[in-house]
Interface confidence: medium
């Protein structure tokens, strides 16, 4: 039998708590252990999200919004734990939650402020339009509206375009910027400021280099320190301009240590890569390799491209031939 | 159905003590707490405190430690509080409440008792 | 202690008219109140809880809400059983307290 008696006075306090979209949290609420617990979650102070009472739930009136997304940690009731385990939050769970504990020797009301925050990767795109070249910071979901800032070799720039469009639960959002002719280095940082989380990417324009028909060609790939960190998993994407689309040389994955190579010209060395070198070779080199290769280190929070121009010229002999 | 049969009036000296009892009936008496309520004309109604009916746990409002002491017999489904030392502010009614899970609080009340302090 | 002042005190309504009361929480009490009905030979009855929750048996004229702190009771239409004193109580947190009451009168 589990009598009903709730006491002592406890202040109410208040805690938030940041879930991801459509991941499981926990909303937090701990009373001084005792017997008879009654435990109440309500959400806004109208729906009944959770009820526990004479040691069961008692879920007839839950409401539907949360049918099989609950559950207490029934073990440590008893220790005063009186936490709830919330599976799948979406953009709709924001709010307060309430939790209405009574025991023998206490009634507390705890409320909890439920933020949740959606950050798919974001990417920074190299793009050809006509004769125009662009940078593109995009981000497919984004939830609260991010903070996207632009930097021109190391200097904030504040002109930028912000392409926004709006869904149910969250922004896609993309940030397009001007390089046409331009040598500098560009930066975009795009900032969660609810869920503390930032990406950057960073793109760096290597001077051209002229080779001859059927030479080879080195191109440099190391990332900057500054974002690169080894023990995260990252890829790296070597791709090649044409007809204003890339098409994939080869790709690394830092997690499995496997590199795909779709060009046999194309060769990798594997003691640079464990130095995290990831500079390139491309062999025997033709007129129809002349172009911009692309670089693509990518982790869940950077992106940083690299892009050369070669220009492949005839050999001498070729030119005599012709 | 579910019913709170409180003891009849009272007239008592002051300084002296009063035991009042709440008969509880119509559902299992130890499974809910019982509050006892004063109101008195200058004070409108005040939560006196809980007991809990199956462990005997008690909790009082502060302003009233002191002056009641709440009891419970199980055998005989009746919960008391006894008002000690007496004095013409006691002068009032006194109601015992249920408590509930689901719906909460004084879902059920008491007749009330009438407790006058007089010499 | 949280406070409830109740206002007004009292109120003198016709049949058939629409009165409100009104409960102010001097804390944040989430919801967690009830409205209780007095009758002129001291019998106490519970008519809402949660704010807005009609107890059983009792009539659809009734109503609660809230906006912010401010709790109210509504009687859509009044009838001739309801002119008693009302209560608002309340229970988010030890020791319960009440309002100071609204006597209804009859116009």
């Known amino acids: 039998i589990f009598p009903l008696a709730f006491f002592i006075y406890v202040p109410m306090n208040e805690q938030i708590v940041i879930g991801r979209l459509d991941e499981d949290i926990i909303l937090p609420s701990s009373f001084e252990r005792g017997s008879e617990v009654v435990i109440h979650w309500k959400y806004q102070d109208s729906y009944k999200v959770h009820s526990y009472y004479k040691g069961s739930d008692h879920l007839e009136s839950q409401d539907p919004r949360y049918a099989n997304r609950t559950s207490l940690f029934y073990n440590e009731i008893q220790n005063g734990n009186a936490s709830l385990f919330f599976r799948r939050v979406s953009l709709l769970d924001e709010g307060i939650y309430t939790c209405y504990v009574g025991t023998a020797i206490q009634v507390i009301t705890n409320k909890v402020v439920l933020k949740v925050g959606v950050f798919l990767t974001p990417v920074m795109k190299y793009e050809k339009r006509n004769t125009n070249s662009f940078l593109i910071c995009s981000v497919l979901s984004v939830y609260p509206r991010p903070i996207i800032t632009w930097k021109m070799d190391n200097t904030p720039i504040s002109e930028n375009n912000m392409e926004e469009t709006g869904s149910l639960d969250s922004f896609s959002i993309n940030s397009p910027l001007n390089i046409t002719g331009s040598n500098s280095s560009y930066e975009c940082t795009i900032e969660n400021s609810l869920l503390k989380q930032t990406w950057t990417g960073r793109w760096t324009m290597k001077d051209g280099l002229h080779k001859m028909q059927s030479e080879h060609v080195s191109l440099s790939c190391q990332p900057v320190n500054d974002y690169f960190s080894p023990n995260q998993d990252f890829k790296v994407t070597w791709s090649r301009m044409k007809s204003g689309t890339f098409s994939v040389l080869a790709y690394y994955l830092s997690s499995s240590q496997n590199t795909i190579i779709n060009e046999s010209r194309f060769s990798w060395n594997k003691e640079l890569i464990n130095q995290s070198d990831f500079s390139m070779n491309l062999m025997d080199l033709n007129l129809s390799d002349s172009g911009e290769y692309l670089c693509n280190i990518s982790s869940d929070e950077y992106t940083l491209l690299t892009i050369h121009t070669v220009h492949v010229e005839p050999s001498q002999e070729t030119a005599s031939h012709n | 159905q579910v019913q709170l049969q409180q003891s009849g009036a009272e007239l008592v000296r002051p300084g002296v003590s009063v035991k009042i009892s709440c008969k509880g009936s119509?559902?299992?008496?130890?499974?809910?707490?019982m509050h006892w309520v004063k109101q008195s004309h200058a004070k409108s109604l005040e939560w006196i405190g809980s007991?809990?009916?199956?462990?005997?746990?008690?909790n009082y409002n502060q302003k009233f430690k002191g002056k009641a002491t709440m009891t419970v017999d199980k055998s005989s489904s009746t919960a008391y509080m006894e008002l000690a030392r007496l004095t013409s502010e006691d002068s009032a009614i006194y109601y015992c409440a249920r408590g509930n899970y689901d719906d909460w609080y004084f879902n059920v009340w008491g007749a009330g008792t009438t407790v006058t302090v007089s010499s | 202690d949280i406070q409830m002042t109740q206002s007004p005190s009292s109120l003198s309504a016709s049949l058939g008219e629409r009165v409100s009361l009104t409960c102010r929480a001097s804390q944040d009490i989430s919801g967690y109140l009830s409205w209780l009905q007095q009758k002129p030979d001291g019998t106490i009855k519970r008519l809402i809880y949660?704010?807005?929750t009609l107890d059983s048996g009792v009539p659809k004229r009734f109503s609660g809400s809230r906006s912010g702190s401010d709790y109210s009771l509504t009687i859509s239409s009044l009838e001739s059983e309801d002119f008693a004193d009302y209560y608002c109580?309340?229970?988010?947190?030890?020791?319960?307290?009440f309002g100071g009451g609204a006597k209804l009168e009859i116009k």
């Open positions: 119509g559902y299992t008496f130890t499974d809910y707490a």
């Open positions: 109580l309340q229970y988010a947190s030890s020791p319960y307290t």
């Open positions: 949660s704010t807005s």
């Open positions: 007991i809990s009916t199956y462990y005997g746990d008690t």
